[in-house]
């Protein structure tokens, strides 16, 4: 060892996972979603796991039923705390129809634009939460293809509550929501027995979203 060699006390920086993702959550807010508190609880549990900021993960929320509303844009809030406060205030907008294709398409065309805070080169993730077959399901093929063309990763969540409450077959509904999810479907599609059960998938969903960055 050289006589000039010195031992210096230093602290290695904490390994930081730079989770740069632009995430848009597309929420079904039609009349059949009940109770809405379960949706906001799900949002709270999911969002509090995220490191939200202009140089980290950004989150935007779109709500749809008959029409589509941008609840907040990707660049609206610059911390997890701010987003949590905003998400708690989201009210159910209702609507007699469930226009899922329109909700997804609006998210793709509008929520993921630079004007609304999307960043160039940052991975785009869409999380779609719905409780019923869409009235515009004949438009889904195009909408999903458009998302594919723009490399938007899609996680879809089917809430079976209204089907179970009405003792109805969920087969067609599950098939539709599976078709929305990115491949491999088993890693991108979730179903829950009812709205209250949404919180049970948060951990796995969060892990799978952030695995995208790795």
């Amino acid at each position: 060892v050289s006589p000039t060699f010195q031992v210096v006390n230093s602290i290695a920086p904490v390994q930081e996972c730079s989770t740069q993702l632009d995430i848009v959550i597309v929420l079904d807010g039609s009349n059949s979603i009940y109770p809405w508190d379960s949706v906001t609880a799900f949002l709270n549990d999911l969002l509090e796991r995220m490191d939200i900021g202009p140089k980290q993960t950004q989150v935007g929320i779109v709500q749809y039923g008959e029409n589509v509303t941008h609840e907040f844009n990707l660049n609206k809030y610059s911390s997890t705390e701010e987003v949590l406060v905003a998400a708690k205030k989201i009210v159910q907008r209702g609507g007699r129809q469930t226009m899922t294709a329109l909700g997804i398409d609006t998210a793709r065309k509008e929520a993921f634009t630079e004007a609304r805070g999307a960043r160039r080169g940052v991975k785009k993730v869409m999380v779609i939460v719905t409780d019923g077959e869409s009235h515009d399901n004949h438009r889904l093929k195009k909408v999903i293809q458009d998302c594919e063309d723009e490399n938007i990763q899609r996680f879809s969540i089917a809430i079976l509550g209204s089907y179970n409450r009405g003792n109805l077959s969920t087969e067609k509904f599950v098939e539709e929501i599976k078709s929305i999810a990115s491949e491999p479907t088993e890693k991108h599609f979730f179903n829950v027995s009812d709205e209250l059960a949404l919180v049970t998938i948060v951990k796995t969903l969060g892990e799978r979203i952030f695995a995208l960055e790795a």
């Epitope: 007699r96 129809q97 329109l102 009235h135 093929k141 293809q145």
Partner: antibody
């Protein structure tokens, strides 16, 4: 630019099957951003949607015609086709093919089909 | 199915005048799924407006659209000779896709 051209017999006998083909030029039918539609217009009347197909083969039909309609696609030929079975005089119309994205933005010029013995 | 009712059936106007065409739906239609077409005799329809109010490529700005829910309007601010034709509204949010019965804009 994309152009569409309908082809097929102009005269079909009652109870037979009407068959039309739409050839797409200037663009690929396999580009997944459009549905490929058939629409008809009875003489002096309005427009009626028959159905459409996605390049993957998924079809959507007007329930009023569903039992008699088949739409298919041949991506290798850049064509899609309409078959309407058990025709009657009420099926006499101008048949159009069209590209449907956000509305039907490209149409064929239409072909007149007369059902008569 | 969603029934679209257009009124009036015929509109008789002179060039330079303003034309207002109505399309009423039997149930709510998202404006994103409402389109307007123009058709001249012996020709295929031509897309004018999509999303209820967005002009298609090459459509002059004298054509405008508005409305939401069940009531939609197509306005031609100053009629040109080439605007005399039949106009159709169409919805594609619910299957089956449906067209209105059309409004004929004729020269007075």
């Amino acid at each position: 630019q994309v152009q569409l051209q309908e082809s097929g017999p102009g005269l079909v006998k009652p109870s037979q099957t009407l068959s039309l083909t739409c050839t797409v030029s200037g663009g690929s039918i396999s580009r997944g951003n459009y549905y490929w539609s058939w629409i008809r217009q009875h003489p002096g009347k309005g427009l009626e949607w028959i159905g459409y197909i996605f390049y993957s083969g998924s079809t959507y039909y007007n329930p009023s015609l569903k039992s008699r309609v088949t739409i298919s696609v041949d991506t290798s030929k850049n064509q899609f086709s309409l078959k309407l079975s058990s025709v009657t005089a009420a099926d006499t119309a101008v048949y159009y093919c069209a590209r449907d994205g956000y509305g039907m933005d490209v149409w064929g010029q239409g072909t007149t089909v007369t059902v008569s013995s | 199915e969603i029934v679209l009712t257009q009124s009036p059936g015929t509109l008789s106007l002179s060039p330079g005048e303003r034309a207002t065409l109505s399309c009423r739906a039997s149930q709510s239609v998202s404006s994103s799924y409402l389109v307007w077409y123009q058709q001249k005799p012996g020709q295929a329809p031509r897309l004018l407006l999509y999303d209820a109010s967005s002009r298609a490529t090459g459509i002059p700005d004298r054509f405008s659209g508005s409305g939401s829910g069940t009531d939609f309007t197509l306005t031609i601010s100053r009629l040109e000779p080439e605007d005399f034709a039949v106009y159709y509204c169409q919805q594609y949010g619910n299957s089956p896709l449906t067209f209105g019965g059309g409004t004929k804009v004729e020269i007075k």
